[in-house]
Each structure stands twice: as C-alpha cells, then as structure tokens.
Interface confidence: medium
C-alpha cells in the first residue's frame, strides 16, 4: 500500500457485506476463548471468568462507497463476565447469592484486551481503491467496573483515534457518524 494514501478509519465497526458465495469462511463463529472452569480442586476465593465470550467475526466491510477486497477477521468481545467463587452450588442461592449481594455495586464486563493496527484495502464504486488503517481486536478480558461508571462508555480500552493522516489534498475530519462508518 502507498503510505501517503492511507486514511484512518475511526472505528472498525462498519457496515458488513455478505461474504462472496465462494468464500468458505465461517461467519461469527463463537468460542469461549479457551477459558474453562471446573468445580473441583480450588479454594473458595478462586474466581473464574464465565461469560466473556470471544466471537470470531469474518466479514467484508464497507464504508458505503467501497468494500474490502478480502474479508476482515477479528474478535468481538461480548457478554457480561461473572467472576464467581467456584463451589458446586454456585448457581442459585447459598454462598453465591450472599457473595453477589455484598458486591452489587460492582460489575464485570467483557472488554477489549489486545488490539493491533492493520491496513485494509477497499475497492470502490467508481473503480478506484482506498486504503484504511484500522484497529482490530485480538483478545478479550474481563474488567471490573463500579456502578458509577458511565454506562454509555462501551469502548473501555479501545485505542483512542489517531490523528488522521493528511495526503494529497484529502482533508479529513471526524464526523458524528464516524464511530461507525465513513459515510
């Protein structure tokens, strides 16, 4: 790619485009990220992360005018984490209920852990190309938040947008909709 023609895509959450019929990629294949739990051999204060799901997403992306030349593979961190003491009766009443009632002001959420920046090339409706620099999630983790935290701030550990590159008279500015799409 030409470095001087790379645009910053402020969020990688853009309109998905159906995979080409010949593609054998699996869309939105969910997995638990290799996190396992068992009811034996742990003391009462050991906690496991249940519900922090890493969804594997494979999709073509589009900014409205252009579509990626190949599918983007990334993780989507989803679900609310339940760090629980591992006891045989952890579902339902008993110790588990008391544990949570004492800690109701806190909650655990599944958030982005590791990210990386990559360039993607898009082909466009006018037969040109466009190159975006985007941030994709490569790992998820559970993070504890107090109830006072602003509920709307859902991109807890996402990278802050880099300043847009300027190139060949292409002036960029973040728009209201740029969190999700360039157009």
């Amino acid at each position: 790619f030409k470095n001087d023609a790379t645009e910053i895509l402020y969020s990688h959450v853009v309109k998905p485009v159906p995979a080409h019929p010949s593609s054998n990629s699996t869309l939105n294949q969910a997995r638990n990220g290799g996190r396992h739990f068992s009811n034996t051999g742990l003391d009462r204060n050991t906690r496991v992360q249940v519900g922090c799901r890493e969804l594997r997403s494979t999709k073509y992306i589009s900014d409205g005018q252009c579509t990626s030349i190949s599918p983007l593979k990334e993780l989507v961190c989803a679900g609310e984490c339940l760090p629980l003491p591992v006891l045989p009766n952890w579902i339902g009443g008993g110790y588990g209920t008391k544990y949570w009632s004492r800690r109701s002001s806190q909650e655990w959420r599944c958030v982005n852990d590791k990210t990386r920046t990559q360039r993607i090339q898009l082909q466009c409706q006018d037969g040109s190309t466009r190159t975006y620099k985007i941030t994709v999630v490569t790992a998820c983790k559970c993070k504890r938040y107090t109830r006072q935290h602003n509920e709307s701030s859902h991109n807890f550990e996402s990278m802050s947008p880099a300043k847009p590159v300027q190139h060949h008279r292409e002036r960029k500015r973040a728009s209201k909709s740029s969190k999700h799409s360039m157009s």
Epitope: I69, Q123, Q125, S128, T129, R171
Partner: antibody, heavy 121, light 112 residues
Framework: QVQLVQSGAEVKKPGASVKVSCKAS????????MSWVKQAPGQGLEWMGW????????TYADDFKGRFVFSLDTSVSTAYLQINSLKAEDTAVYFC??????????????WGQGTLVTVSS | DVVMTQSPLSLPVTLGQPASISCRSS???????????LHWYLQKPGQSPQLLIY???NRFSGVPDRFSGSGSGTDFTLKISRVEAEDVGVYFC?????????FGGGTKVEIK
C-alpha cells in the same frame, strides 16, 4: 498504461441474452473495482453498479437489479456484463470504467471504448 | 438517489469567448470527511467520456488550464475561459459522494 478494451457491437432480439466483455491491461486487475455505465442513444450516463474484482462481489444500482449480471474471469483480467431477457430499452452503449488508484472520489479516469448493444425484432 | 440537474441543455458559444455550465444536486455533496466528490466529464462526438475536473476544482492530468471548476454544497459551475474548437461535445457533471454514483443529463456545447 491502463487500457480497457471492450467486445464489439451486438444486435439481439428481444428476450435474448448478451454478454459484453471488458479486458483490462496495464495494471493488476484484482486491485481495482470495475464499474459499468449505460448510455442510451442521445441520452445521459447511468451508473449500473460495480464488481469487486478481488472478491467477485457485485453491487447493482436499483434500476439494474434482476436481469443484469456482473462477472469476472481474473485469469484473463476480464470483466463481463450479461443482460438477460433483453428489452428494446436496453439498446445502449455500455462502458466499463475504472477510477484512479488510491484516491477514492477522484473521478472515473479510465473508460472502455464502449459496446453498442442493439435490441430489435 | 441524488439527482444532478445541469443547465443549460445546449450552449452555443463563440470561439475565444468564455462559457459556463451549471450543475445542481438534490442534496449536499459534501461528504462527512470534508471532501466534495463532484466531477466534470467531456464526451466528444463518437468518443468515450473523459475526465476533466475531479473533486470540484482539480484538473485531471493533461486538461488545459482554461477549464476550471468551482462551487460547494449543491451548486457547482464549470467554466471555460476561452472556448476552442476541440472543446465541443457534451459535458456531464457527476457525484460520487453518495451511492449510487449519479450523472447530470449533460450540456451540449457547440460553436455558433
């Protein structure tokens, strides 16, 4: 240099099909999308849609959904426009076109020479 | 779809004199990224269209400096400072800010 060379004129009867080819040279075919533009006799230009030459995914303008099919043969750097169930109003010159590299929205710089499709009984 | 309206439909001109073509869009062509994707093409008789101006005012390579473009939002103008014989043909404006890409109906420039 970039060249888009289209197949020759076609005369077809209503209800038949036609397939127009556009052979690209002078650049890496699968790097740039290919668009199609229609120009009816004495009329303006209509953008029909485009095809992602890497993935093969086509996008059609609303007026060109259904009977129109964009396809590729990347081994010979060629894009195709097929029109099925031809109607008299399909009589037009069809252009394959391509924009400038790396600069979206810098206009359509490269045009095929056009293929005249005549639909007549 | 964005409707592009050109005027006049026909423009008889005198060689060496200026000429001006107007193009109006049904909605703003300023993209959220700050660019305005409005272009001008010339289709000479018996030829494919050729790009003259891109993004309102940028001349494409090889286009003489007698051609200039201006405008913003929904109103745009192509000016020819001194018309030459080779400038005859149909001029089209086009936008690629919105999907689908659309063209104006054309303005036919001919010598008086």
């Amino acid at each position: 240099q970039v060249q888009l060379v289209q197949s020759g004129a076609e005369v077809k009867k209503p209800g038949a099909s036609v397939k127009v080819s556009c052979k690209a040279s002078g650049y890496t075919f699968t790097t740039y999308g290919m668009s199609w533009v229609k120009q009816a006799p004495g009329q303006g230009l209509e953008w029909m849609g485009w095809i992602n030459t890497y993935s093969g995914v086509p996008t059609y303008a609303d007026d060109f959904k259904g009977r129109f099919v964009f396809s590729l043969d990347t081994s010979v750097s060629t894009a195709y426009l097929q029109i099925n169930s031809l109607k008299a109003e399909d009589t037009a010159v069809y252009f394959c076109v391509r924009g400038r590299e790396y600069y979206y929205g810098s206009g359509i710089a490269f045009w095929g020479q056009g293929t005249l499709v005549t639909v007549s009984s | 779809d964005v409707v592009m309206t050109q005027s006049p439909l026909s423009l008889p001109v005198t060689l060496g004199q200026p000429a001006s073509i107007s193009c109006r869009s049904s909605q703003s062509l300023e993209h959220s990224n700050g660019n305005t994707y409005l272009h001008w093409y010339l289709q000479k008789p018996g030829q494919s269209p050729q790009l003259l101006i891109y993004k309102v005012s940028n001349r494409f390579s090889g286009v003489p400096d007698r051609f200039s473009g201006s405008g913003s939002g929904t109103d745009f103008t192509l000016k020819i400072s001194r018309v030459e014989a080779e400038d005859v043909g149909v001029y089209f404006c086009s936008q690629s800010t919105h999907v689908p890409l659309t063209f104006g109906g054309g303005t036919k420039v001919e010598i008086k």
